[in-house]
């Protein structure tokens, strides 16, 4: 009758931070000699526990190994980390000089279940414009085992990634995932979100989500129009410059008279549209008695550090008596009106 070393579990899974018991029982108290636990095989195997006087932090024996009739050489590993993953062997030695290995258990593979980090979604450094294709990348790290599912969504619709990679490709204590998706921006995307969803065995069917608000990555340039209201009195003309459906809020509006700055607006009261874009209206009151000649009024809109958008509007001087009451609007948004 030969001593047998029985490791009943082929594998165990344990969450990082928890403790696990690795079971090992012998069928004999003989021959006399120590029992040791190793991780791995061959020359590189690492001693994990020895049923002697040595101290092993985080590893304890489950039963009283000093008891003469004890056949249970199970160990408990506490506060498990991903580095503890591997195959553990319970090994019986025969006492001698040196001790000789006579029997090993079949091994128990320890899988350390480590949760993925919350996914982080990054987008382009510069804002994109409607109809532009932009890439978003989602990254999560530190998970184990390797099997993981990553999905992309935009406004509830699943997107297909350009590529998804899990590294390293070989066996490791923990893994990282990176995925890239391409999104075509549209002008209605200010309120949209791109979501990266990661599902893993450690997450109890509650996937982790990383969110990118497209408002951080899109620029919608305004439509600019200048109009002239009917005169409120003989001496006044009202001009309106309207910037519509722009995002983000960053807007500067300048009124010029014949190319010279007349007024600088720093908009404060923007109106918000349901799609998340903004509108701004600037009123410019022109004193007609001061102008006999034609005057070109320019509304210059600078949005989000982009080149200025200009719209001109010509108001005819008092000398044009034959054009009294007339006003023309040109395709380039130039308009003429007499002063009287």
């Amino acid at each position: 009758t030969e001593v047998k070393v029985i490791q009943p579990e082929k594998s165990v899974s344990v969450a990082a931070g928890d403790s696990t018991v690795l079971n090992c029982t012998l069928t004999s108290l003989l021959p006399v000699g120590p029992i040791r636990w190793y991780r791995g095989v061959g020359q590189s195997r690492q001693l994990i526990y020895s049923f002697t006087t040595e101290h092993f932090p985080r590893v304890t024996n489950v039963s009283d190994a000093t008891k003469r009739s004890n056949l249970d050489f199970s160990i408990r590993i506490s506060n498990v980390t991903p580095e503890d993953a591997g195959t553990y062997y319970c090994v019986k030695f025969q006492r001698g000089s040196p001790d000789t290995e006579i029997q090993s258990g079949g091994g128990t593979e320890v899988y350390v279940l480590a949760k993925p980090s919350p996914p982080e979604v990054s987008g382009p450094a510069d804002r994109g414009i409607p109809d532009q294709k932009v890439n978003f990348t989602c990254k999560s790290h530190g998970f184990s085992p390797r099997n993981i599912t990553l999905k992309w969504f935009k406004d509830g619709q699943e997107l297909h990634p350009l590529e998804t990679t899990v590294n390293p490709s070989g066996k490791n204590v923990s893994y990282n995932i990176s995925s890239t998706v391409r999104v075509v921006l549209n002008s209605m995307d200010v309120n949209s979100k791109v979501i990266c969803e990661v599902a893993h065995i450690t997450l109890d069917r509650s996937p982790l989500r990383g969110i990118a608000n497209l408002s951080n990555f899109i620029r919608v340039s305004p439509t600019v129009k200048v109009t002239q209201q009917s005169p409120t009195s003989m001496n006044q003309v009202n001009l309106t410059c309207r910037a519509e459906r722009f995002y983000p809020e960053d807007l500067q509006l300048i009124w010029l008279e014949n190319g010279n700055v007349s007024r600088n607006d720093t908009p404060k009261n923007l109106t918000k549209n349901t799609d998340g874009t903004y509108n701004y209206t600037s009123l410019f009151l022109v004193n007609s008695s001061a102008h006999r000649e034609d005057v070109v009024f320019t509304c210059q809109v600078k949005h989000d550090q982009q080149p200025a958008i200009t719209r001109n509007h010509t108001v005819l001087g008092f000398a044009h008596s034959s054009d009294q009451g007339s006003m023309q609007t040109f395709p380039d948004n130039n308009a003429t009106h007499n002063w009287n």
């Epitope: 069928t27 004999s28 003989l30 006399v32 008891k67 003469r68 009739s69």
Partner: antibody
């Protein structure tokens, strides 16, 4: 002073499962480094070790009965039990439960219960 | 399995006699051996553990010796209450096994 008491039906029909319970009093089944064993004795014959459950969890069975035997523990009731399936007349015996002492050796025994397998 | 051979299977001795029972293991079991006494209709009782150690409350007339494969159990002075069957049991190897028993009677 720990005491053991076997309980279960005295008559079991062939092919059925024999179920016995050993109730521990005067001590906790989950404390100390003990084996809790089942042993049987056929009429007029010697002792046969059936199996044991160790306090730390492992269960050991006699290979000659392993395919038919299950030993389990219920710490909440301070009991351990034996199930022997597919019994025949050859399983007729006095069944004992025992506890190993601080030193080796079974130092506490139940009084034994006779189980007859007959139709 | 380890075979435990006890001899004799029965013996008859007078009160006060020295009684010796032997137990032989089919292979070396070091000193992982216990001796039990079983009286008719009763459960076995532990007398000797680890081949030579007297269990608590057991009279000193009982003793045990031996190591490896050969073991001896002795009653130095047989008493009427010692009428019983005596069993050796090894626990070096699973399954634990008992000897066939030695029935001791008074002449």
């Amino acid at each position: 002073q720990v005491q053991l008491q076997e309980s279960g039906p005295g008559l079991v029909k062939p092919s059925q499962t024999l179920s016995l319970t050993c109730t521990v009093s005067g001590g906790s089944i989950s404390s100390g480094g003990y084996y809790w064993s089942w042993i049987r004795q056929h009429p007029g014959k010697g002792l046969e070790w059936i199996g044991a459950i160790y306090y730390s969890g492992p269960i050991y069975y006699n290979p000659s009965l392993k395919s038919r035997v299950t030993i389990s523990v219920d710490t909440s009731k301070n009991q351990f039990s034996l199930k022997l399936s597919s019994v025949t007349a050859a399983d007729t015996a006095v069944y004992y439960c025992s506890k190993e002492g601080y030193h080796s050796g079974m130092d506490v025994w139940g009084q034994g219960t006779t189980v007859t397998v007959s139709s | 399995d380890i075979q435990m051979t006890q001899s004799p299977s029965s013996l008859s001795a007078s009160v006060g006699d020295r009684v010796t029972i032997t137990c032989q293991a089919s292979q070396d079991i070091s000193n992982y051996l216990n001796w039990y006494q079983q009286k008719p209709g009763k459960a076995p009782k532990l007398l000797i553990y680890d081949a030579s150690n007297l269990a608590t409350g057991v009279p000193s007339r009982f003793s045990g010796s031996g190591s490896g494969t050969d073991f001896t159990f002795t009653i130095s002075s047989l008493q009427p209450e010692d009428i019983a069957t005596y069993y050796c049991q090894q626990f070096a190897y699973l399954p634990w096994t008992f000897g066939g028993g030695t029935k001791v009677e008074i002449k």
